[in-house]
């Protein structure tokens, strides 16, 4: 879904690799399904555009056209540009592909702010740095939009890796992994590496930069350090997870359970922020308020609106607190927490100040339809998506963004007793599945 | 109500270091509402922004000041000063301090200004 | 760098006279933006923040809109101690470090 800040506005210039590699586990080793170890042709298949999204090459049609694909754990619809449009460098067209098959239906996708409209159809699609399979998968091309896409965001298309029962126009419409995994051999799993740029990035850089990997049917143990945490996917819709727990630099912020998840908690890599309930919201940011009170900033850095600059090199991560999230673990009564860094919170703007500052915004912000955790979590770790054992994994991401005295972390197990209890229930309405702002 | 005031030599010779100190009455400098700053006018020019100070010490400076300028806070006397150092001819302006304030973001009290000139 | 052009330069207007200010930054400020008055020989003064809230004491004939990159500073009826020079500032890149360069309304 695209809003405002729905898709990612970081740049991913790998950070630097950690120095130290913890001993795996072998007993986690044993259970990952899929192809272990190296994919090689896969490792830094992302690009992530100075601040607008992280996306893979995919081809589509024969014979094949090469698009940009904007990689999104927030929906379901495999949807590319099939029409002129003005932020588009070239788009699908789908008279010059012989295996293109029309399916005789339309699909309206609207947002809170937005659109895209489109034509149903299949065609023949691979990723050139994926797995050497090529597979009819649906496609909506999009026809007419608004808000959709984004002026030299360099993707041309929104590739939605969750489960059908979000798909547009219904559940019907198989979305494209299910058809990858179905019409091959390949494992139900996929792994996303997203390498956040940690500084500003002038345009060149930006579009040299390399924004990390998503790596399709397995688990690729260069891209993190320590074990991978596993927390169950409480509902294939969404990549819809439990959080118990929430700390800001230790200290707990006393909540019930179900406030963090209230309406759900989902992990979206077409979101940029860290987005939290209105009330979660305002308890976090008084609490790192507290923390960095040695210098104020006003209230619209807050509201993620203004920018606050720092000389460069000196921006003081230190006065910004940690931020864990407790996530139900797979063990009854275990959890473990994933910690990030202000070096993730903090989001690099580039072209606003001098060449001689650092300039960011604060990347957690309000929101009315549940946790999110997008780019902001997900920069920090390297994120399996375990869709064959309905979990997500969590591991310290080898090119996450951090400094000489603390790294992002993953760590457990912990004892949290009734963590079912955290879940909201959604009332069941025939629209509840028709949500598509994500604001 | 609250005033401000600056206080200095007028006269500053080449190469040697401006020094001037605001003092606030009226209220006091270690409010958490507000950051305190330094801006100046060269004569017939616009405004130029040289820095901002909060209570506790944390300071910013202009980029293009860097490296000259120093702005710090003394709670006790409910003052906070600025020293520029090396100046030139072109640092010769109205020095104006002023409490930064609507939420850390405006300019929303003045002092009444100071002429410094520099020359030998 | 943002940077922010006031035009025009100069005004020259009557008493009673409507004065409409131009504020234009090189990139959205969003509504992160400050209008201030400045007669000679004294400090400037707060007239107008946040784009378009006015500051404590200033007359209702002082109003501003704009939002993102075009601003605008109406003096609905050029009263004579309105004859000053008027700038803008942006506040979207904190701490607030740009003015603009100034329009100076004049009696004609």
């Known amino acids: 879904t695209h809003l405002g800040i729905r898709l990612p506005l970081r740049s991913g210039l790998a950070g630097p690799p950690l120095g130290l590699r913890l001993p795996r586990e072998t007993d986690e080793e044993s259970e990952e399904p899929g192809r272990r170890g190296s994919f090689v042709e896969m490792v830094d298949n992302l690009r992530g555009k100075s601040g607008q999204g992280y996306y893979v090459e995919m081809t589509v049609g024969s014979p094949p056209q090469t698009l940009n694909i904007l990689v999104d754990t927030g929906s379901s619809n495999f949807a590319v540009g099939a029409a002129p449009h003005p932020f588009l460098h070239r788009y699908y067209q789908r008279q010059l592909s012989s295996t293109y098959r029309d399916l005789r239906k339309g699909v309206y996708v609207p947002y809170t702010q937005g659109k895209w409209e489109g034509e149903l159809g299949t065609d023949l699609v691979s990723i050139p740095h994926g797995p050497n399979v090529t597979v009819r998968a649906n496609i909506a091309a999009i026809t007419e939009s608004d808000k959709f896409f984004i002026n030299g965001s360099n993707w041309e298309g929104i590739l939605g890796l969750a489960y059908a029962e979000i798909a547009r126009p219904d559940d019907s419409l198989e979305p494209f992994f299910d058809s990858l995994v179905k019409q091959t051999h390949i494992p139900n799993i996929f792994s996303l590496q997203l390498c956040g740029a940690g500084f500003p990035l002038n345009q060149t850089e930006a579009l040299a930069s390399v924004g990390g990997s998503m790596i399709i049917g397995g688990i690729d143990h260069s891209l993190y350090t320590g074990r991978l945490w596993y927390t169950p996917i409480r509902r294939e819709w969404y990549y819809e997870v439990i959080i118990v727990r929430v700390e800001i630099n230790g200290q707990d912020l006393k909540m019930d359970c179900k406030e963090y998840n209230y309406d759900k908690s989902i992990v979206d890599s077409g979101t940029t922020n860290l987005r939290l309930p209105k009330k979660v919201f305002e308890a976090a940011v008084k609490s790192i308020k507290a923390a960095s009170s040695t210098e104020k900033f006003p209230d619209g850095f807050w509201l993620g609106e203004q920018l606050v600059c720092w000389q460069a090199g000196t921006t003081p991560w230190n006065i910004f607190p940690v931020i864990s999230l407790y996530l139900m673990g797979e063990v009854t009564n275990q959890s473990f927490r994933i910690t990030i860094l202000p070096q993730q919170y903090l989001r690099p703007v580039e072209d606003v100040a001098t060449s001689q500052d650092d300039c960011y915004k604060f990347a957690v912000s309000q929101s009315s339809t549940g946790t999110v955790m997008g780019a902001v979590i997900m920069e920090g770790f390297y994120v399996v998506f375990d869709r064959a054992r309905k979990r997500i994994g969590f591991a310290v991401s080898a090119c996450h963004v951090h400094d000489e005295f603390r790294t992002a972390a993953v760590e457990g197990p912990f004892v949290t007793a009734d963590m079912e209890d955290c879940g909201y229930n959604i009332p069941q309405t025939d629209e509840s599945t028709l949500m598509t702002g994500r604001a | 109500q609250l005033q401000l005031q600056e206080s200095g030599p007028g006269l500053v010779k080449p190469s040697e270091t401006l020094s001037l100190t605001c003092t606030v009455s009226?209220?006091?400098?270690?409010?958490?509402?507000?950051?305190w700053g330094w801006i100046r006018q060269p004569p017939g020019k616009g405004l130029e922004w040289i820095g901002n100070?909060?209570?506790?010490?944390?300071?910013y400076y202009n980029p293009s000041l860097r490296g000259r300028v120093t702005i710090s806070v003394d709670t006790s006397k409910n003052q906070f000063s600025l020293k520029l150092s090396s100046v030139t001819a072109a640092d010769t302006a109205v020095y104006y301090c002023a409490r930064l304030g609507h939420g850390y973001n405006y300019f929303d009290l003045w002092g009444r200004g100071t002429l410094v000139t520099v020359s030998s | 760098e943002i940077v922010l052009t006031q035009s025009p330069a100069t005004l020259s207007l009557s008493p009673g006279e409507r004065a409409t200010l131009s504020c234009r930054a090189s990139?959205?400020?969003?509504?992160?933006l400050a209008w201030f008055q400045q007669k000679p020989g004294q400090a400037p003064r707060l007239l107008i923040y946040d784009a378009s809230n006015r500051a404590t004491g200033i007359p209702a004939r002082f109003s501003g809109s704009g939002s993102g990159t075009d601003f605008t500073l109406t003096i609905s009826s050029l009263e004579p101690e309105d004859f000053a020079v008027y700038y803008c500032q942006q506040v979207y890149v904190w701490p607030p470090r740009t003015f603009g360069g100034g329009t100076k309304v004049e009696i004609k």
């Open positions: 990139q959205s400020v969003s509504s992160y």
């Open positions: 009226g209220g006091p400098i270690s409010s958490s509402s507000y950051y």
């Open positions: 100070i909060y209570y506790s010490g944390s300071t």
